[in-house]
Interface confidence: low
């Protein structure tokens, strides 16, 4: 089928970077400025993506490939092909609808993006807390209390984590 189509359709001879111009007897015309065609046989060229505002250009548009964007400092990409930029927060914070808020007690975030996650509950694995958690770091679990030599002490386990979100910081 593809072979038959290519024999019948002169547009199939137009390579990437051109389009089959119906207004000019189906001649293969180069894509105009700020447009591209990434495959052959196209009847139109696609408009290049413009990286404006909070987006910045990671890769310039060419006649055969679209521009690629990333985000200006202080923001990070979200979605396929960096379709959105989302504000960075500091470690120890999460982005809420009201902006960056500190992680609630019992939760942490060690990245500039994403949500605060509950500290590991060491006791679920039969272990004790070796190093307390912070807003930026998870707790470090140590050996189980039974593994500790007599007289050794462990740090008090953390309180149960609360849901992150509405507590004013």
């Amino acid at each position: 089928f593809e072979r038959t189509r290519s024999l019948q359709d002169p547009c199939s001879n137009c390579p990437a970077g051109t389009f089959c111009d119906n207004n000019r007897n189906q001649i293969c015309s180069p894509c105009p400025p700020n447009s591209f065609s990434s495959a052959g046989g196209q009847r139109t060229c696609d408009i290049c993506r413009q990286c404006k505002g909070v987006f910045r250009t990671r890769k310039e548009c060419s006649s055969t490939s679209n521009a690629e964007c990333d985000c200006t400092p202080g923001f990070h990409c979200l979605g396929a092909g960096c379709s959105m930029c989302e504000q960075d927060c500091k470690q120890g914070q999460e982005l809420t609808k009201k902006g960056c808020k500190d992680c609630c007690f019992g939760t942490f975030n060690d990245q500039k993006r994403g949500i605060c996650r509950p500290w590991t509950n060491c006791s679920l694995d039969g272990k004790s807390v070796l190093v307390n958690g912070t807003k930026e770091r998870d707790v470090v679990c140590g050996p189980s209390p039974a593994d500790l030599s007599p007289g050794a002490s462990s740090v008090t386990p953390p309180a149960p984590a609360r849901e992150p979100g509405h507590s004013p910081q």
């Epitope: 404006k52 505002g53 909070v54 987006f55 379709s83 959105m84 930029c85 504000q87 982005l95 809420t96 609808k97 009201k98 902006g99 509405h166 507590s167 004013p168």
Partner: antibody, heavy 121, light 106 residues
């Protein structure tokens, strides 16, 4: 300094369409969401909704779904409010207001001067 | 939707005096309330955000307090330029303005 400058007053007939603008300057337009607020004569302020200025996604308050449309011209750092099929009760001053917390919610630190829309046969 | 009940709707006070306006939310708004001064023919002006944080350039005669569902806004040592309508705004979940309080000087 940060400024929001709105278009001038409009006199329209019922059933017509109006489109008012809010031109921002002094900051990166696509970094902060833009809300629209209505004040009918002798009444209080009423939040109409907001538009995310980098994704272009609008959110409308329940009372403003249907005839109301928010849009952007990011190259001109301008937000627009369009009201279709105008009714007498649309007579009001409309304000644009910039959120403080990026394209998220937050208090309004910056306001336009308002645009009076009068609907009268 | 969160409702904001603001009272009183109007009040009259003497120069040099003190007034207090209250806003009650229909649910806990976690201190996410701001207060605005609005004069005719102008855009509203932010006075206080996050319950009690004074906006730069606003005199310390203005103050705010509250928690949970109940919040208040006060102006002490009233001056002629304080004549305006004042609004509370919750921004905990979308936005809702209070009904406004028109302040007049006796």
């Amino acid at each position: 300094q940060i400024q929001l400058v709105q278009s001038g007053p409009e006199l329209k007939k019922p059933g017509e369409t109006v489109k008012i603008s809010c031109k921002a300057s002094g900051y990166t337009f696509t970094t902060y969401g833009m809300s629209w607020v209505k004040q009918a004569p002798g009444k209080g302020l009423k939040w109409m909704g907001w538009i995310n200025t980098y994704s272009g996604v609008p959110t409308y308050a329940d009372d403003f779904k249907g005839r109301f449309a928010f849009s952007l011209e990011t190259s001109a750092s301008t937000a627009y409010l369009q009201i279709n099929n105008l009714k007498n009760e649309d007579t009001a001053t409309y304000f644009c207001a910039r959120g403080n917390d990026g394209n998220y919610y937050g208090w309004f630190a910056h306001w336009g001067q308002g645009t009076l829309v009068t609907v009268s046969a | 939707d969160i409702q904001m009940t603001q009272s009183p709707s109007s009040l009259s006070a003497s120069l040099g005096g003190k007034v207090t306006i209250t806003c009650k939310a229909s649910q806990d708004i976690h201190n996410y309330i701001s207060w605005y001064q609005h004069k005719p023919g102008k855009g509203p002006r932010l006075v206080i955000h996050y319950t009690s944080t004074l906006q730069p350039g606003i005199p310390s005669r203005f103050s705010g307090s509250g928690s949970g569902r109940d919040y208040s806004f006060s102006i002490s040592n009233l001056e002629p330029e304080d004549i305006a309508t004042y609004y509370c705004l919750q921004y905990d979940n979308l936005y809702t303005f209070g009904g406004g309080t028109k302040l007049e000087i006796k």
